[in-house]
Amino acid sequence: MDSFNYTTPDYGHYDDKDTLDLNTPVDKTSNTLRVPDILALVIFAVVFLVGVLGNALVVWVTAFEAKRTINAIWFLNLAVADFLSCLALPILFTSIVQHHHWPFGGAACSILPSLILLNMYASILLLATISADRFLLVFKPIWCQNFRGAGLAWIACAVAWGLALLLTIPSFLYRVVREEYFPPKVLCGVDYSHDKRRERAVAIVRLVLGFLWPLLTLTICYTFILLRTWSRRATRSTKTLKVVVAVVASFFIFWLPYQVTGIMMSFLEPSSPTFLLLKKLDSLCVSFAYINCCINPIIYVVAGQGFQGRLRKSLPSLLRNVLTEESVVRESKSFTRSTVDTMAQKTQAV
């Protein structure tokens, strides 16, 4: 990043002049944080606590089951993606507290803010994989009986992670530190080397591959699944599907502000009032997207309570019940309506 472009929210459009330097700053701007930044800090703190503990628990519960239970493989990978992203939060938190001063160096600037994008791509690709799995269970049960195994599930996850890493490379490559203001402040942001087309291309690819295309395909996928389930009046399957839809819906809800501001800023004139407003909201949009990293364990717990009627079991056993039920076809030939319903019902929340 030979130039430091603040027009795509890759965690950072920091042109404010606030400073916490102990020496007297030249500028007379307030040392108090902006309201959006304060809100972002609160969200980061909550997400870190819930995300680290919740996802660690999910990893612990599913890791033991991953060898024999395909659902556990899905949830293990989702939890790992969320857990990894949560590890960057203390650094991002510290940076906002210091008015976006970045004292952590160039390598950390490239890696840590990119983790949320890795999480976005990994999560949506894993959700797509899980959704395809659910679709096949409902519509191609015989194929599932013959080919659906742990090995294939791990391959699918590896492909999802590989693609996610590949799609995160632009953010990683175009991210650098630089200094501005008096007294000097180190900033971490993206730089597209005076290439507006490249910047817009990155924003469009992110919007299409990380949001619009998955939204379209998953909506179609779950519409078919729900129609099939409702047509068979499988009430428990519908309950389970509600959980699945909740996780998928939460992904799109929490990424929406980030994606909208990102695409808008890549097309707006940097001096325009709208751009300047969006720039101030950037940290908040990032923190809102980060809610994805802690929401899944919450959904699993709520789902577990729903399935149990009330919380009678311990948290690990409740999660185990939600996350590791397997959708295996036990009888080779008899694919009755009830068998298919049972499979749909047992493929638990995304």
Epitope: N5, K17, D21, N23, R178, P183
Partner: antibody
């Protein structure tokens, strides 16, 4: 490659205003700050002010009342405007890019020679 | 305001000799947050725009010959040219960018 090209009047009458344009290429104004520095005949360098990547400005206290720096992102241009010119404002005026690290001036314009005389 | 003073104001040396010039600031240029000294050295050859040589007191700008070395911390800084070449004929300025930038008066280097 990075370039800063300056254009402006060579001669201005006392009490008049000065306008110099610095057109940049090879980098984006959304990414780098641009400073203005002047050098009076036979004298040293004097920092005038800066416009940062986000559009905020800082000025030398000695010039704050009569100096203004602005920019046009789309045209990659920075503008220096100075009012109430006196003969001691005769100098070479430079625009310079703020470096990525160190808050230094890593690329300079060719300079605009200004003579304030009646 | 931070005031920068350079010494000597001029010096004449023969090619191949070692040269040191001094720069002092009225207050420390060490930033507690970044742990860097915000002092830079510039070279201005006759009829040319200034050129950045050193930043952060001791970091050489890319493309600058390694005979140029910056040192010092806090308020006292030095630029050393280990073996002066004919093309080094210039005025050398130090500049602080810890706060609003201020240049030193310059040291004129002449070749005997």
């Amino acid at each position: 490659q990075v370039q800063l090209r300056q254009s402006g009047p060579g001669l201005v009458q006392p009490s008049q205003s000065l306008s110099i344009t610095c057109t940049v290429s090879g980098f984006s104004l959304t990414s780098y700050g641009v400073h203005w520095v002047r050098q009076s005949p036979g004298k040293g360098l004097e920092w005038l002010g800066v416009i940062w990547s986000g559009g905020s400005t800082d000025y030398n206290a000695a010039f704050i009342s009569r100096l203004s720096i602005s920019k046009d992102y789309s045209k990659s241009q920075i503008f220096l405007t100075m009012n109430s010119l006196q003969t001691d404002d005769t100098a070479i005026y430079y625009c310079a890019r703020n470096s990525r690290l160190g808050n230094c001036f890593d690329y300079w314009g060719q300079g605009t020679t200004l003579t304030v005389s009646s | 305001d931070i005031v920068m003073s350079q010494s000597p104001s001029s010096l004449a040396v023969s090619a191949g000799e070692k040269v040191t010039m001094s720069c002092k600031s009225s207050q420390s240029l060490l930033n507690s947050r970044t742990r860097k000294n915000y002092l830079a050295w510039y070279q201005q050859k006759p009829g040319q725009s200034p050129k950045l040589l050193i930043y952060w007191a001791s970091t050489r700008e890319s493309g600058v010959p390694d005979r140029f070395t910056g040192s010092g911390s806090g308020t006292d800084f030095t630029l050393t040219i280990s073996s002066v070449q004919a093309e080094d004929l210039a005025v050398y300025y130090c500049k602080q960018s810890y706060n609003l930038p201020a240049f030193g008066g310059g040291t004129k280097l002449e070749i005997k």
